[in-house]
């Protein structure tokens, strides 16, 4: 868990963790942006979606995402048995049947179309490092998350919990 | 089973400190958002402060800003509520309290059995 | 500063009647919301969180609805056991709690 010496002391608990309901608990359409308030945006190219971070023009509509908010539960740490407590995972999905997928291989976030059950790497475990920000941690790979590099979404590796706080993997959500 | 155990309530003088503890065990501390609420004798609930899992960030009301400061051992499983400049209207049982989920803001699922304080000459 | 306003601040129902109580946030907060239970003496119950999802090992009867700014409460069928004070909670902004509502033998 953060906090102590680091991400990886609960790799293994979050690859055990598991949904505890198929249905989300709540539903969210949020337009998404950086910590620096550059938006997420999402284009239709060659019968496939890219993703772009971007700075809009003035009355630019942004983007919106639906986030579906699903419980996990997450096995002790500190036993290694029973139950330590829930998680909140989010699955993203900018357009009807695509949803980001983490290609963990390429370290690439990826807009994949799909049908429920949704695969593990579409599931993302959500923090709140700031009150007003949240940031997405890979289900299939604890300690990686969503992240901007190079005007784009990457998948970045956090080694410690002081990492925690970088910009480039800090979003905001906003209905408007 | 998760416990969260409030101490160092009492009786002292307007303008006087203390210092709130919370023993927190049955869970992986370092996890979690935690708070401290109160409540004045026959009032209602008010949130008083929140941390961040790695104590990164802390959080206030306005009625409380630059008189209290929440911090947190995660080493000790220990969150603390440090009160300054402390007036009659602070005056309450305090509660330390911890969020419903791992990393998130989202709700307080857990409530310790609270401890009073009494600001008074 | 989100302020929340709940309605009744206190209201007499008698076992096995509806009781509804309402809260407004001064601005929408989605479904950001808990409801709580506090009897007297003890610390505040998580009952409802994200506006309808019922924590656990809570009865069925304690129900959640609503978004945006009004939200409401509802006990199907009062047991002696929930004659209480109830608050509402935001955490989409900020946290703040409703002024609480009693629930009283009627």
């Known amino acids: 868990a953060f906090g102590i010496s680091g991400v990886q002391k609960y790799t293994r608990a979050l690859h055990d963790s598991s949904i505890t309901g198929i249905s989300p608990i709540t539903e969210y359409l949020a337009s998404l942006s950086t910590y620096n308030d550059q938006s997420i945006t999402f284009a239709l190219e060659d019968e496939s979606y890219e993703i772009y971070v971007e700075d809009l023009k003035k009355d630019e509509k942004k983007d919106k995402v639906l986030l579906s908010y699903y419980e996990s539960q997450h096995p002790s740490n500190e036993s290694g048995d029973g139950v330590d407590g829930k998680m909140l995972m989010v699955t993203l999905s900018p357009t009807k049947d695509f949803w980001l997928h983490a290609n963990n291989k390429e370290h690439s976030v990826e807009l994949h179309k799909c049908e429920k059950p949704l695969p593990d790497q579409a599931f993302f475990v959500l923090h709140n490092m700031h009150s007003n920000c949240v940031s997405f941690e890979c289900k299939t790979d604890p300690g990686v998350f969503i992240g901007v590099k190079d005007n784009h979404l990457a998948l970045i590796k956090v080694d410690s919990s002081e990492n925690l706080c970088t910009e480039n993997i800090l979003f905001k959500l906003s209905e408007t | 089973e998760v416990q969260l155990v409030e101490s160092g309530g009492g009786l002292v003088q307007p303008g006087g400190s203390l210092r709130l503890s919370c023993a927190a065990s049955g869970f992986t501390f370092s996890s979690y958002w935690m708070y401290w609420v109160r409540q004045a004798p026959g009032k209602g609930l008010e949130w008083v402060a929140a941390?961040?899992?790695?104590?990164?960030?802390?959080y206030y009301p306005e009625s409380v800003k630059g008189r209290f400061t929440i911090s947190r051992d995660n080493a000790k499983n220990s969150l603390y509520l440090q009160m300054n400049s402390l007036r009659a209207e602070d005056t309450a049982v305090y509660y330390c309290?911890?969020?419903?989920?791992?990393?998130?803001?989202?709700?307080?699922?857990?409530w310790g059995q609270g401890t009073l304080v009494t600001v008074s000459s | 500063d989100i302020q929340m306003t709940q309605s009744p601040s206190s209201l007499s129902a008698s076992v096995g009647d509806r009781v509804t109580i309402t809260c407004r946030a001064s601005q929408p907060i989605h479904n950001h919301l808990d409801w709580y239970q506090q009897k007297p003496g003890k610390a505040p119950k998580l009952l409802i969180y994200?506006?309808?999802n019922l924590q656990e090992g809570v009865p069925s009867r304690f129900s959640g609805s609503g978004s945006g700014t009004d939200f409401t409460l509802t006990i199907s069928s009062l047991q002696p056991e929930d004659f209480a004070t109830y608050y509402c909670?935001?955490?989409?902004?900020?946290?703040?709690f409703g002024g609480g509502t009693k629930v009283e033998i009627k």
């Open positions: 941390i961040t899992p790695n104590a990164g960030e802390d």
């Open positions: 309290a911890r969020g419903q989920y791992y990393y998130t803001k989202y709700s307080l699922g857990y």
């Open positions: 909670f935001q955490y989409k902004k900020g946290w703040s």
């Open positions: 994200f506006g309808k």
